[in-house]
């Protein structure tokens, strides 16, 4: 055998007698004419040797130690090589040791390629004989992080100030790679972080540093668990001891990314959390121990990852294959923060990819399932775009704005279904015709239905909200000049039962200049409340809206404004209102920035109310609320 170590490798090879066996014949290392029982080879040296016996593996072991100094220069990060190559070494039980020394402020991360590592306790051994012993240091004190075998879940171990990794390979093992790499990280501000990755169901047993001896005083150790969101994790403590604390309290803390209750603090004697969905961290925090009688803190625990118990495996099909330009998002509804531990709530695609948010797009059929203790924690938001690019093709074309039944059958509440209606600029306008006449939501007459339609401009630069409308009113149709979004927003779970009341048809019609026209056909004995768009923010500058109010032949309409003055102050232009009888074309014009609003007026025939805004000064906006009431003509109106 020849071993030549590169001079800057900082490697020392030691061949020495292993545990003595009851073999009659001794064995020696032979160099030239000398017979020796221990050989040390340092960087830059070259030694040629043989053994005096046929089976040196029964007598000798080899240790290869590489010192990695990250204190005086850059650290050689990346994949760690087995150096010298195992093929150049005698076939002895071999231990490769990497001793990395770094500054206290530098984090070092050992990354283990697949197969990952499985921690073993005292007295246990690895089936294939390959063991990884990992230790760190606190000042001059060596801290054992643990001993590990292959085929486990531990993928990364982060430490700071230094790390010693020993890989023991039996003489017959063919392994020729270290199986890990070293990376630098920012300070982890704790003893170590162990990352454990679960690909599927399984369990991992893990131990505190120095186990079964005591965990270092007042230290913090963290385990990060990466768990597929469709599985559930439960933690159980197999064995623990508490030390005698003088200050602070020994505890474990759970951190669940995305949770509003972080960190969850538990005593070691508490029942530990179960049924956690997705990733979580567990930290062990020591205390300041009593100097006279410290006792020991130690912990051995198990994480069990399995498919959820007592939960429906029902799969829902969402068929969006015939839809275009549509996306459906299932997401957590906003909740008030609570300090209580809350299990995860997930939606899964094909039962494999689970997350707290899921967006489905049109053109495909999707299979979804839920992993959630309470589905009311989720809601759905849907967006669909209906656009017309060629005005010759779209004119007079109609589309039904209806929530597809597949979506209604999902066990999650629909929050918003938004249709974005896009038309070619200055070529076409839109008309919305509801299946049931609509009521405009006002403070005076609020909607109390399970859903409403929110109509707003979809032109990015334009801040124009036409209002919120619900079934059961007098608005027969709404015409809008240009792009709008119509959002069906639900307010109660009873929407499922009332879904039949929804239904809105949009048609592309010839272009008109007004921002919006509301066609109102009031019912007898009901008071219709109407208000200008952008209520509370004021009708946008230079915007014009109209109401076409129908009055049946045997009825009289009373038009009432709810304030004496409009309150608008114009910076430029004039704000005015025109009330025009449709039959006679007779009209009254009111200057809204000067005149008082008209007293209640009576109209025997259908009439128009048109309101046009000026450019108001800020804070003096145009907001008008008015009502229309029908009464039979026979009634004496004086």
């Amino acid at each position: 055998f020849e071993i030549a170590l590169p001079r800057e490798s900082n490697i020392t090879v030691l061949i020495k007698l292993g545990t003595p066996t009851l073999l009659a014949k001794p064995c020696y290392i032979v160099i030239s004419k000398r017979h020796i029982t221990m050989l040390s080879i340092k960087s830059g040296e070259r030694i040629v040797f043989t053994f005096s016996c046929q089976s040196p593996e029964n007598h000798f072991v080899i240790e290869i130690q590489k010192n990695i100094d990250c204190m005086s220069g850059p650290c050689p990060f990346g994949e760690v090589q087995l150096q010298p190559s195992t093929s150049l070494l005698p076939t002895l039980n071999r231990t490769f040791i990497w001793d990395v020394k770094a500054h206290k402020s530098i984090g070092l991360e050992l990354q283990f390629s697949i197969p990952r590592l499985r921690q073993i306790g005292p007295g246990e051994s690895c089936p294939d004989g390959v063991t990884h012993s990992i230790s760190g240091r606190i000042d001059a004190t060596v801290v054992r992080i643990g001993t590990f075998c292959s085929n486990g879940t531990v993928s990364r171990i982060k430490m700071q100030e230094g790390v010693k990794m020993a890989l023991h390979l039996p003489w017959f093992h063919p392994r020729n790679v270290s199986g890990f790499s070293i990376a630098n990280r920012s300070s982890i501000k704790r003893l170590c972080i162990i990352e454990s990755v679960f690909e599927g169901e399984g369990s991992a047993t893990l131990m505190s540093a120095n186990y079964p001896e005591g965990f270092p005083e007042d230290e913090l150790m963290t385990w990060q668990f990466v768990v597929p969101a469709h599985l559930r994790a439960s933690v159980s403590f197999l064995n623990f001891n508490l030390s005698n604390c003088e200050r602070k309290e020994e505890r474990v803390e759970y951190y669940i990314p995305g949770s509003t209750t972080n960190p969850e603090v538990f005593k070691l004697e508490d029942k530990q959390p179960g049924n956690m969905a997705g990733n979580f961290n567990l930290s062990l925090q020591g205390c300041d121990q009593d100097a006279q009688s410290p006792g020991i803190l130690r912990l051995q625990f198990q994480v069990l990852v399995q498919h959820p118990q007592n939960e429906s495996n029902k799969i829902y099909v969402v068929d969006l294959s015939n839809e275009r330009a549509m996306s459906l998002t299932i997401e957590p509804r906003p909740v008030k923060q609570s300090r209580k531990f809350v299990p995860g709530c997930f939606v899964c695609l094909e039962s494999r990819t689970c997350s707290s948010n899921l967006t489905l797009t049109s053109g495909s059929k999707h299979k979804i399932s839920f992993l959630c203790d309470d589905l009311t924690r989720l809601w759905m938001n849907v967006e669909k775009t209906i656009s017309c690019t060629d005005h010759r093709y779209c004119q007079r074309k109609s589309y039904s704005l209806q929530v597809p039944s597949d979506i209604l059958h999902l066990p999650v509440e629909l929050h918003d279904f938004s249709w974005k209606l896009l038309v070619p600029k200055d070529r076409l306008s839109l008309v919305l015709v509801p299946a049931q006449k609509l009521q405009q939501h006002t403070h005076e007459k609020p909607c109390n239905t399970s859903f409403s339609y929110l109509v707003a401009s979809a032109i990015p630069s334009q801040d124009l909200y036409f209002g919120s409308f619900c079934p059961g009113g007098s608005i027969k149709q709404i015409q809008v000049k240009q792009n709008i979004s119509v959002t069906l927003r639900t307010f109660a779970p009873s929407f499922q039962q009332e879904a039949s009341r929804q239904g809105l048809t949009v048609s592309f019609i010839p272009y008109f200049k007004e921002e919006g026209v509301f066609t109102v056909t009031p019912d007898t004995k009901s008071k219709v409340y109407l208000r200008t768009p952008n209520w509370d923010r004021g009708l946008p500058s230079l915007t014009s809206v109209s109401w076409n109010i129908s009055v049946p032949r045997d009825q009289v309409a009373c038009l009432t404004f709810f304030k004496e003055r409009s309150g608008v102050v114009c910076q430029t232009g004039r704000a005015f209102m025109i009330i025009q009888e449709q039959r006679t074309r007779a009209e009254e014009i009111f200057s809204l920035d000067e005149d008082v609003l008209p007293k209640p007026s009576f109209h025997h025939h259908s009439f128009w109310v048109n309101i046009s805004n000026c450019s108001p000064t800020s804070g003096k906006q145009l907001d008008l609320l008015f009502s229309v009431t029908l009464t039979p003509r026979t009634v004496d109106l004086t």
Epitope: S32, E45, R46, I47, V48
Partner: antibody, heavy 120, light 112 residues
């Protein structure tokens, strides 16, 4: 009989390059570490570089690192030293030397040397 | 790097008389194997160096037995029991323990 014969020396200007060769015979070349050692006129011996049997490991004296490259062709029983960015202080007789098979870095055979003169 | 220091730098000797050259290393050349990795070379005028002694005291093949090497750790000696005229040249010690391999400055042996 073991023989090492160097060639390729000559006069070269500072900053120039030169490639030295060493032809080996009389032994199994691929089993031995090989070295280049130099001797400046009237001065002592200075080890320059070495190369492992299969060429997988190489080492150099600090003063030539990054400028000189040692290589070998076991099929042709040849050792090479590619020298670039030559300086006046590289002027020397360059010897190729074989490392003994036993432990350590002992040189049991040397070539006759080839003179490299770096001068403008 | 290990520094090798030889003395004397020049050694005039009468043929038939013994000669001794000393070599000191800045670090011990005694290996865990029990060997001292120190070699001695002779470079005759106009020739390339030839190995005399390796591993501190082992004579290379073909080297007359009037040459012997001794010492351990950091102090070594090359002895010529009876100098002959053909022994003229420069003697170098070399540490063969680790790279970079280093030589002593050389001791010039000349006939009185």
């Amino acid at each position: 009989e073991v023989q090492l014969v160097e060639s390729g020396g000559g006069l070269v200007q500072p900053g120039g390059s030169l490639r030295l060769s060493c032809a080996a015979s009389g032994f199994t070349f691929s089993r031995y570490w090989m070295n280049w050692v130099r001797q400046a006129p009237g001065k002592g011996l200075e080890w320059v570089a070495n190369i492992k049997q299969d060429g997988s490991e190489k080492d150099y004296v600090d003063s030539v690192k990054g400028r000189f490259t040692i290589s070998r062709d076991n099929a042709k029983n040849s050792l090479f030293l590619q020298m670039s960015s030559l300086r006046a202080e590289d002027t020397a007789v360059y010897y190729c030397a074989r490392v003994m098979y036993s432990s350590g870095w002992s040189f049991d055979y040397w070539g006759q040397g080839t003179l490299v003169t770096v001068s403008s | 790097d290990i520094v090798m220091t030889q003395s004397p730098l020049s050694l005039p000797v009468t043929p038939g008389e013994p000669a001794s050259i000393s070599c000191r290393s800045s670090r011990s050349l005694l290996h865990s194997s029990g060997y001292n990795f120190l070699d001695w070379f002779l470079q005759k005028p106009g020739q390339s160096p030839q190995l005399l002694i390796f591993l501190g005291s082992d004579r290379a093949s073909g080297v007359p037995d009037r040459f012997s090497g001794s010492g351990s750790g950091t102090d070594f000696t090359l002895k010529i029991s009876r100098v002959e005229t053909e022994d003229v040249g420069v003697y170098y010690c070399m540490q063969a323990l680790q790279t970079p391999i280093t030589f002593g400055q050389g001791t010039r042996l000349e006939i009185k």
